[in-house]
């Protein structure tokens, strides 16, 4: 059923109730849009920085990747760890932090084809919804092989990131995933999510752009920790 | 800023029917699309319907396909959510969001629909 598959890792990693971030080169994600509930188009997210038992890597945060926490560690017990760093050793692209992948084991800085894995599935649609086309006619959302050569402009269906065009990162859209605008600064980002907190990640959102980060805003500072503001700012 | 506005909830018998309606003022960039979501106490909030402007396409939850249609007009900036053969487990507050260019996402107040048996 469609609420089996919002609690499932097929769509994941957002705070409810809409999406998260698609993940990024080059900075820490913009995962949801802020964790946003209902309320005055208020935004309000939430951190946990306990450690989170995990299953896989697309159920810690965008700067984080699941591993067991000691060397040789029980294999059975694993938690989100912080991301690492550029040149240091790595045995996959998820444990490089965001701007960096996995290259002859050692974290690299990515260019612009490359991207974390998060939004880097191929996303299905059979979610056991129902997706009618407005027109009434069955319209196929995978990308003809010309996409491939011209990127993709705003709106446009998408499979990754690289299949977009230059200020734009593949992100969801309903069940879909469409080319959307890269964060710029100011705008409003998440980081930290949880599975606790994933839901409805119907409404995806890129990272930060190019020398951005996601960051508390320092006004928000005095908030409760489950409302702070987070925003994309210059490293 | 983008506000969303919802009405026409309400209280109303079971097998009977409602329409939501969700407007949206202050739009400066264009929209993708637009969902309706509920949220009933003691449970998580739910993905009801949607419709994607970009795609052309609706979406459904399999708990309202066959009773509940979305429809609505991108260049008015409004959605709506035509409820038929409710039931009382529809009984909730149904929010409006929209996923927008500018790269924020917005949702409305809510609106409460009950449905008595």
């Known amino acids: 059923t469609l609420n089996s598959v919002l609690n499932s890792n097929a769509i994941k990693n957002l705070p409810p109730p809409l999406g998260g971030a698609a993940g990024h080169p080059g900075s820490a994600v913009s995962a949801a849009p802020g964790i946003l509930y209902p309320g005055g188009n208020k935004y309000q997210t939430i951190d946990n920085y306990q450690p989170y038992p995990c299953a896989e890597d697309e159920e810690c945060g965008t700067d984080e990747y699941c591993a067991s926490p000691t060397r040789g560690g029980d294999a059975g017990v694993q938690i989100c760890l912080a991301c690492r760093k550029r040149r240091k050793r790595c045995m996959r692209h998820a444990m490089c932090c965001p701007g960096n992948y996995c290259k002859n084991g050692i974290c690299v800085s990515s260019d612009q084809n490359h991207f974390r894995g998060e939004i880097e599935e191929t996303i299905t649609e059979s979610f056991g919804n129902d997706h009618s086309t407005l027109d009434g006619y069955s319209r196929r959302t995978t990308l003809s092989s010309k996409m491939y050569h011209t990127k993709g402009q705003e709106g446009s269906v998408c499979l990754r990131s690289s299949d977009c065009a230059s200020g734009l990162c593949c992100a969801r859209h309903f069940w879909s995933k469409i080319c959307k605008p890269v964060l710029k600064e100011g705008q409003v980002c998440t980081k930290h999510r949880r599975k606790g907190s994933h839901g409805l990640e119907i409404f995806q959102r890129c990272y930060c752009g190019e020398g951005l980060s996601c960051r508390i805003q320092k006004d928000h500072h005095q908030a409760s920790n489950s409302s702070r503001l987070h925003t994309c700012q210059r490293h | 800023e983008v506000q969303l506005v919802e009405s026409g909830g309400g209280l109303v018998r079971a097998g009977g029917s409602l329409r939501l309606s969700c407007a949206a003022s202050?739009?400066?960039?264009?929209?993708?699309?637009m969902g309706w979501f509920r949220h009933a106490p003691g449970k998580e909030r739910e993905f009801v319907a949607g419709?994607?402007?970009?795609?052309?396409?609706?979406y459904y939850a399999d708990s309202v396909k066959g009773r509940f249609t979305i429809s609505g007009d991108n260049a008015k900036n409004t959605v709506y959510l035509q409820m038929n053969s409710l039931k009382p487990e529809d009984t909730a507050v149904y929010y409006c969001?929209?996923?927008?260019?500018?790269?924020?996402?917005?949702w409305g107040q809510g609106t409460q629909v009950t449905v008595s048996s």
């Open positions: 419709i994607s402007w970009t795609l052309g396409r609706t």
């Open positions: 969001a929209s996923d927008e260019s500018d790269a924020a996402n917005y």
């Open positions: 202050g739009r400066t960039f264009s929209s993708y699309g």
